[in-house]
């Protein structure tokens, strides 16, 4: 606790002090007082610089004195042998003795008292800006008239702050202008205009005289303008050094005038006014501004319209124009919006075709669709080339935005059939010779693929099993081969309405309208071993003449086996219907006259014993297209016969083209349309 006075004695005083001692005393008097320390007795071993034994007086970091030896008072009326006066309220006294003393030394006696200090005169730095008043234990500052004491209780200033200017026009000047401004003051003026107006400050050079800068270029007195995060100034000197017109780009401006203790000049005077906040005429690429003006200010509205092929993307919605308003902050609303090239996006993929990954999907880019050749071709034309249009769609010159459609190429086998040796009397064939060939496992029969979703077969094949299992793409019908081939799942079987259903199909003698369609659940993927056969055209070009050659294929009965394991095929000529009538039925279930022959039937065979037989039913009788020799069409379907190895009867497909097309159209999925 601070004390007003106290006594300090060396160890054992007045007896001799011991060797090897170090003792310190921390003296503290109340704040606002100094310390008067005086010694009334001093008897300490003398040495040079008091190196052996000493009493040391320290104030802060300063050594006020170091004492040793013997002292006596110079004044007979005073017992003081040594004294110290410090203007601080703390002092440290340290006594040290070394390991030996040649004589007996008694040490020292000292006293301290708190003394008043004159803060107004005792220090180099004057504590008050104007008037300083000392009192015992402290001081206070005071000010001349019209000045007030700042919160720091040391500095006086003029009360020149707090004014807020809200009018759209006005004038502000330094205190007492044009008389000298007050020293040691900080004047703050605030201009606060309505949002959307910027403060514009106007000065004349001659209306400004403020104490000049020091040699380092720092203003001693200064005028500063602060608008948000922008600062103009500090300014000082004779004549205004800054721009005479200051556009602050803000509706709020703080004016700060700071003066020091010396060098008062006449000060300054300025005018200000509020301008509607200008917005820059921005260069927005690929767009047009409406209305077009040389200058845009607060509350102006423009419509920015994108050029063709450009759009504004906001979130997920694309637009061709947007509105922008000049805002109170001098910035355009919707400034983030830009007219970007229309992006048509990644082009949609198409079934059985592909589109090369485009380098760009922006306006003007070009892509090309191609079909998986040679198994598919582009049905709806247009060449497959699309460009990214201004509306954001990929557009083709012919089809517009409609996508190309890749449909199977029909009637083109990957490898042509070659008869290797003399079905009955036929040759081994490969599925690539007859990629349209479908195998039905129950009953053991055939069919012809006519497109992705449809299989054509004989009505008698499916009348007893409306959920047939079918396979495509395999030359062999051995189980391991079928397991690797494509199994087709039926969705629905459509038997021709003219086909007569019988209680006992085994006794059938009428095979008229022996035709059926099987709609598949899933589309068939075409390739070298799976590909459809064409349908006949309706023109007379597709009327068969006697002697016209056709190909049959299947896994039916051969000379050696009841059922063939590997696909067999034969080339047969068309024959007159009477040739089929003339052949005696091998195992008749009725009179020969009971068997029905109609124009819906084709008779073929009779050459070298080549014929279709049991198990080949439903397979195609494929004839070269008269208008395109590279293609085959299904002229007939294996239907029935009087005797294997002679002549066979085939359903005349041309007579059913209308029914086939109608059935397919009425039972197509949207994907097919």
């Amino acid at each position: 606790e601070p004390t007003m006075y106290g006594e300090i004695l060396s160890p054992n005083y007045p007896q001799a002090y011991p060797s090897e001692v170090e003792k310190s005393w921390d003296i503290e008097v109340p704040e606002g007082y100094g310390i008067h320390l005086y010694f009334t007795h001093l008897d300490i071993e003398l040495s040079e610089n008091c190196a052996y034994d000493s009493v040391q007086i320290i104030s802060g970091d300063t050594e006020e004195g170091r004492l040793c030896g013997q002292r006596s008072s110079n004044n007979p009326h005073s017992p003081i042998v040594e004294e110290f006066q410090v203007p601080y309220n703390k002092l440290q006294v340290i006594f040290k003795s070394d390991f030996s003393n040649e004589e007996r030394f008694t040490g020292f006696a000292a006293y301290y008292v708190a003394t008043d200090i004159n803060e107004c005169t005792d220090f180099v730095d004057v504590p008050c800006s104007h008037f300083c008043n000392n009192f015992i234990g402290g001081y206070f500052c005071s000010c001349p008239p019209e000045y007030f004491l700042h919160d720091d209780m040391k500095n006086c200033g003029v009360n020149c702050s707090g004014d807020v200017f809200t009018a759209l026009i006005g004038e502000i000047a330094s205190p007492n202008y044009p008389k000298p401004y007050p020293e040691n003051s900080r004047c703050e003026y605030q201009i606060r205009l309505e949002k959307g107006f910027q403060v514009v400050v106007t000065l004349r050079r001659e209306d400004f005289d403020v104490e000049a800068a020091d040699s380092a270029g720092n203003c001693l007195d200064s005028l500063v303008f602060v608008a948000g995060d922008r600062q103009f100034g500090p300014y000082c000197g004779h004549g205004f050094p800054g721009p005479l017109n200051i556009e602050t780009k803000s509706n709020a401006l703080d004016i700060i005038f700071q003066t020091d203790l010396t060098g008062q000049k006449k000060g300054w005077k300025l005018r200000y006014h509020g301008d509607p906040m200008p917005c820059p005429k921005e260069d927005t690429p690929n767009s047009v501004w409406e209305p077009a003006k040389a200058k845009y200010v607060f509350r102006d509205v423009v419509q920015i319209t994108c050029l063709d092929g450009f759009e504004v993307v906001e979130g997920r919605v694309g637009a061709t124009s947007f509105y922008s308003t000049c805002q109170s902050n001098g910035k355009w609303s919707n400034s983030k919006l830009k007219c970007q090239p229309v992006d048509c996006g990644i082009p949609e993929s198409i079934e059985n075709g592909k589109v090369e990954d485009p380098e760009s999907t922006l306006f003007g880019s070009v892509i090309r669709y191609t079909c998986e050749e040679p198994y598919y071709y582009m049905e709806n034309g247009g060449g497959g080339e699309y460009h990214c249009a201004g509306n954001g769609s990929w557009v083709n010159e012919v089809l517009g935005p409609e996508l190309p459609k890749c449909v199977p190429v029909c009637g083109v086998p990957r490898e042509p059939f070659e008869e290797k040796q003399r079905i009955i009397g036929g040759s081994d064939a490969d599925i690539k010779n007859f990629p349209w060939q479908v195998f039905f496992d129950n009953p053991w029969a055939g069919g012809a693929l006519i497109n992705e979703y449809w299989v054509l077969t004989a009505a008698h094949v499916v009348e007893g099993n409306r959920e047939p299992t079918m396979y495509v793409g395999s030359t062999s019908v051995q189980t391991s081969r079928l397991a690797k081939s494509k199994m087709l799942t039926p969705e629905h079987v459509f038997i021709h309405p003219g086909w007569k259903l019988l209680e006992v199909p085994e006794g059938r003698t009428n095979f008229d309208n022996d035709i059926a369609l099987v709609r598949l659940k899933d589309p068939v993927k075409m390739g070298p071993t799976v590909s459809p056969i064409c349908l006949p055209g309706t023109s007379s070009d597709y009327n068969l003449m006697d002697g016209d050659l056709g190909l049959i294929s299947g896994w039916g009965r051969t000379e050696k086996r009841d059922r063939a394991v590997r696909l067999k095929a034969a080339r047969l000529p068309v024959a007159p219907l009477r040739k089929c009538k003339e052949v005696k039925v091998e195992k008749p279930t009725a009179d020969a006259e009971a068997y029905v022959f109609t124009p819906n039937m084709i008779c073929a065979g009779g050459e070298k014993g080549m014929d279709s037989c049991k198990g080949d039913s439903g397979g195609a009788f494929a004839v070269q297209d008269p208008n395109d020799k590279t293609k085959f069409y299904a002229a007939g379907l294996v239907s029935w016969g009087p005797q294997c190895g002679t002549y066979g009867l085939y359903t005349r497909v041309k007579n059913y083209v209308d029914w086939i097309m109608k059935t397919m159209q009425e039972n197509s999925t949207p994907r097919e349309d």
Partner: antibody
Framework: EVQLVQSGAEVKKPGASVKVSCKVS????????MHWVRQAPGKGLEWMGT????????IYAQKFQGRVTMTEDTSTDTAYMELSSLRSEDTAVYYC????????????WGQGTLVTVSS | DIQMTQSPSTLSASVGDRVTITCRAS??????LAWYQQKPGKAPKLLIY???SLESGVPSRFSGSGSGTEFTLTISSLQPDDFATYYC?????????FGQGTKVEIK
Amino acid sequence: EVQLVQSGAEVKKPGASVKVSCKVSGDTLTELSMHWVRQAPGKGLEWMGTFDPEEGETIYAQKFQGRVTMTEDTSTDTAYMELSSLRSEDTAVYYCVTEGEAGRPFDAWGQGTLVTVSS
Amino acid sequence: DIQMTQSPSTLSASVGDRVTITCRASQSISSWLAWYQQKPGKAPKLLIYKASSLESGVPSRFSGSGSGTEFTLTISSLQPDDFATYYCVQYPSYSWTFGQGTKVEIK
């Protein structure tokens, strides 16, 4: 109707080889795929391998890889299965079996050949 | 190779019982699974092919079901002639593999 006639029973010493034949009648071997299946006494059926005429390659079960060889002589319609480095665990009835059609795994089975491996 | 796990290995049942044998494939085999019946000293006889198709000449009390990896052979009413060992076999592509067999014996 296909018939398969296999060679007679064999007794072999460990380390030796055995060659079992299977003669096809009622059909030609070229029209068929021949499989070989074995059955150890009191044990289950084990598929050994087959000749795949479509690919013209022989496929063996992993277990017999390197020890079994299946061959065919189409001129005599005879299939052969040779198993080498015989051990006692190879004692079994060996069947030749034709592959079925239209989803049936096996069609005709031979009468079986008992191979006994004993020292 | 695809593994076939057949269960149970042995099954005791009486004439007239409904019997179910299960076969599990280590990976999907679609419907390429058959069931064979074997009697001592005889070659196996095909009952069911393609998981559920009944071979001609096989009594209708035998039925098969399942696809993918889980398959079942059911004998709706066990007859004296049905006491035998039953095997499943998978054949979607080479290699083919048999189950270890289920022996159906008289209780």
